[in-house]
Amino acid sequence: SNNKRAPYWTNTEKMEKRLHAVPAANTVKFRCPAGGNPMPTMRWLKNGKEFKQEHRIGGYKVRNQHWSLIMESVVPSDKGNYTCVVENEYGSINHTYHLDVVERSPHRPILQAGLPANASTVVGGDVEFVCKVYSDAQPHIQWIKHVEKNGSKYGPDGLPYLKVLKAAGVNTTDKEIEVLYIRNVTFEDAGEYTCLAGNSIGISFHSAWLTVLPAPGREKEITASPDYLE
């Protein structure tokens, strides 16, 4: 189009929230969607001065096609006023956001309520337990099975017999450790499973039960209780 036009905001709804209070280590995204003819350019100021990549560790990203500024893993020194300046040869507009970085107190891990959930399956079936962990401090996660030895769930010291089924290792991602898969289930797999998450503040855990049912048409084969796990 030949209709020359100074810059204008195209989506003011996305710009209404001026104050952004964000926990440390989170990602912040500021948007200034605009139009104009010719297409305007966008630049960013921090506290009224040109915002340069070297002004913050890790720099920042500008997505021109989305009219956005993205800062990952924010720290307290990122606090301040961020102004987008959108301009072409016919004019200039600007909009300022205020960023507050909240240094949250690290807490013991929080596990999502209701997870892992009790499950049941037939012999030979597959089952999965899911555990969602929220932690400010880096958590270590384990899946534990409560087992029996010599017909007892507890040792002479009164402590339960436990078997670590899965633990976060060097090559394990958080997503991988959050799910425990049990394939080709047997009666011996029945019992209590615990998702444990710990960090430098403390440990939290949730448990769930797996019930194993006989496969259809195989009821008559079951004559004795399953062997105890060693």
Partner: antibody
């Protein structure tokens, strides 16, 4: 027997530095977070710092942030507290305390074992 | 920070009588795992604190059953059902849910 033994305390002038150590025995040190807690003479208890089992995470009380550094050497079963720019108000008994372990626990997940403490006096 | 407020500052109780110490937190210590992370300690002169009660109401190993913990959310109580001479000490509550870990100011228990 599970034991924590602090050392390194003494009398020091304001602005100077001191390094405290805590020797752990009787448990798998490398599997536990560790804390420092202090107690000024005749006063209550104040948490100072914590370090995760592998040393990757450290947190401090605001009163010591930027001046104190917590560290550990798992090969020597030793916890340390480097105290710089000491102030008169840092005068206290410093206790080494065992924190949360890495595994399932029946009982408290830490803060069950305390050392005897080492006295730090900051005075001109 | 979570503030732990203990009361009374001191308490004089006759031998064999009940002693009750209160502790109030500025925010709930009930965690998503269903446990309430308040701990109680006993400290005698010249000694480090000794753990008495963990997770609101669980007695630590070796602690006499005259010591009990109770409460919910933000209000907690340590009770010594029948005070003995060896119970003379300062008692502290502590929150163990987030850093900075914080302690109550302490309650000094003496014999009347």
């Amino acid at each position: 027997e599970v034991q924590l033994l602090e050392s390194g305390g003494g009398v020091v002038q304001p602005g100077r530095s001191l390094r405290l150590s805590c020797a752990a025995s009787g448990f798998t040190f490398s599997s536990y977070a560790m804390h420092w807690v202090r107690q000024a003479p005749g006063k209550g208890l104040e948490w100072v710092a914590v370090i995760s089992y592998d040393g990757s995470n450290k947190y401090y009380a605001d009163s010591v942030k930027g001046r104190f550094t917590i560290s550990r050497d798992n090969s020597k079963n030793t916890l340390s507290l480097q105290m710089n720019s000491l102030r008169v108000e840092d005068t206290a008994i410093y206790y080494c305390v065992r924190g949360a372990g890495r595994g399932y626990t029946y009982g408290p997940d830490g803060f069950d074992i305390w050392g005897q403490g080492t006295m730090v006096t900051v005075s001109s | 920070d979570i503030v732990m407020t203990q009361s009374p500052d001191s308490l004089a109780v006759s031998l064999g009588e009940r002693a009750t110490i209160n502790c109030k937190s500025s925010q709930s210590l009930l965690h998503s795992d269903g446990k309430t992370y308040v701990y109680w300690y006993q400290q005698k002169p010249g000694q480090p604190p000794k753990l008495l009660i963990y997770e609101l109401s669980n007695r630590f190993s070796g602690v006499p059953d005259r010591f009990s913990g109770s409460g919910s959310g933000t209000d907690f109580t340590l009770t010594i059902s029948s005070l003995q001479a060896e119970d003379v000490a300062v008692y502290y509550c502590m929150q163990y849910i987030e850093a900075p870990l914080t302690f109550g100011g302490g309650t000094k228990v003496e014999i009347k």
